[in-house]
């Protein structure tokens, strides 16, 4: 069984979070994917999503978030550029599969953004003076308002959880809704 885990990323303001969410490509290649934040005691909030159906290697930008879905490789790339302290929180990738529940992809990301100069960038970081060029072909996608009949009974865990699942994705069976947020300009 696969354990539902989370990874803690500690980055500085101005740096870029650049992560991959892998999925079973045979099942989910063209499914719409989303990047969500889960604040303690709140429902997951969708910050950005791919188009529906998801287009291969076609960047979608919502504000400082860029999503790129590589169908052939079963990978969703998520970039959050010019990070701010207020971006700190727990994030996850999900796959929309209406009318079924969304699927959550491992692993969750606990992002901690701190103020201050980063010094030498780490292997996955850009410098604090990062001027990240957005690909010129990016598009904006509207995310669906997803409503589930179930409710959240407690806040998500702050550390690694031993929730076992048989596959690399997990059904979000305890989520009331995924709140659609407006696409910012």
């Amino acid at each position: 069984a696969t354990k539902l885990t989370e990874e803690k990323y500690e980055l500085k303001e101005g740096q870029t979070l650049d992560v991959k969410c892998d999925y079973t490509l045979e099942k989910f290649a063209s499914s719409q994917k989303a990047w969500q934040i889960i604040r303690d005691g709140e429902m997951p909030k969708t910050l950005a999503c791919t188009e529906r159906p998801s287009k291969n290697s076609h960047p979608v930008q919502v504000g400082r978030i860029i999503l790129e879905d590589y169908h052939d490789h079963g990978l969703l790339r998520v970039r959050m550029v010019n990070l701010q302290v207020e971006d700190s929180g727990l994030y996850q990738c999900v796959i929309y599969q209406p009318p079924k529940e969304p699927h959550m992809l491992f692993d969750r990301i606990r992002l901690v953004v701190t103020k201050g100069f980063s010094g030498t960038p780490g292997s996955n970081e850009n410098s604090t003076q990062n001027v990240y060029k957005i690909p010129p072909t990016t598009t904006k996608a509207l995310c669906p308002l997803y409503t589930s009949p179930r409710t959240v009974t407690q806040a998500p865990p702050k550390s690694t959880a031993d929730v076992s699942t048989p596959d690399s994705e997990i059904n979000l069976t305890n989520v009331t809704d995924i709140i659609r947020v407006p696409v910012f300009n």
Partner: antibody, heavy 124, light 107 residues
């Protein structure tokens, strides 16, 4: 010692399949993605795809889709790459390589550990 | 796919010389570039990651720089043991692609 040990050289006929193994030791096999890269004699390097040994998820370069299958056996810390419908142009050294990442989920594609390579010769 | 054009394809230099290899991507790869060294009959070895970071244990005479589409790999003072073929590899876009390689020889 941290290493990837690959299976021995193979000679195959066109149309046949080959399965190359890559045994990891000295580190936690399920913590790092395994990638496969090939190199035809005297030629450059060509990425074939990746596999997450923990979950078994895979991704293949388009030109190999339908012919390549990457699998693993976590009980013996071994990854496999099977290539079918072999043709002469598949004659190459096939390498397995570990993708190192500070964070498991990070978009980092650095191959810091390589097997010694397996020569696959396709000849009638 | 992102094409990586590496030049020169081969070069010959004297011990102690400064050697420079360039790699040009067909599109912006956001510093997502690595450099490898491959000696005959051996597997590649990671030298530089994310355009400019020196891999642990690699001599400081090796360095990398660049941004956008243009990247440079430098050996500040060529040593006999540096005879090898050097490859760049981008990961700014999938599929991952490698440059054609630069064979470095000693004069």
């Amino acid at each position: 010692q941290v290493q990837l040990v690959q299976s021995g050289a193979e000679v195959k006929k066109p149309g046949a399949s080959v399965k190359v193994s890559c045994k990891a030791s000295g580190y936690t096999f399920t913590s790092y993605d395994i990638n496969w890269v090939r190199q035809a004699t005297g030629q450059g390097l060509e990425w074939m795809g990746w596999m997450n040994p923990n979950r078994g998820n895979t991704g293949y370069v388009k030109k190999f889709q339908g012919r390549v299958t990457m699998t693993r056996d976590t009980s013996i810390s071994t990854a496999y790459m099977e290539l079918s419908s072999l043709r002469s142009e598949d004659t190459a050294v096939y390498y397995c390589a570990r993708r190192r990442a500070v964070y498991r989920s990070s978009w980092e594609w650095y191959f810091d550990l390589w097997g010694r390579g397996t020569l696959v010769t396709v000849s009638s | 796919d992102t094409q990586m054009t590496q030049s020169p394809s081969s070069l010959s230099a004297s011990v102690g010389d400064r050697v420079t290899i360039t790699c040009q991507a067909s599109q912006d790869i956001f510093n997502d570039l690595n450099w490898y060294q491959q000696k005959p009959g051996k597997a590649p070895k990671l030298l530089i990651y994310h355009a400019s970071n020196l891999e642990t244990g690699v001599p400081s005479r090796f360095s990398g720089s660049g941004s956008g589409t243009d990247y440079t790999f430098t050996i500040s003072s060529l040593q006999p043991e540096d005879i090898a073929t050097y490859y760049c590899q981008q990961y700014g876009n999938l599929p991952l692609t490698f440059g054609g390689g630069t064979k470095v020889e000693i004069k």
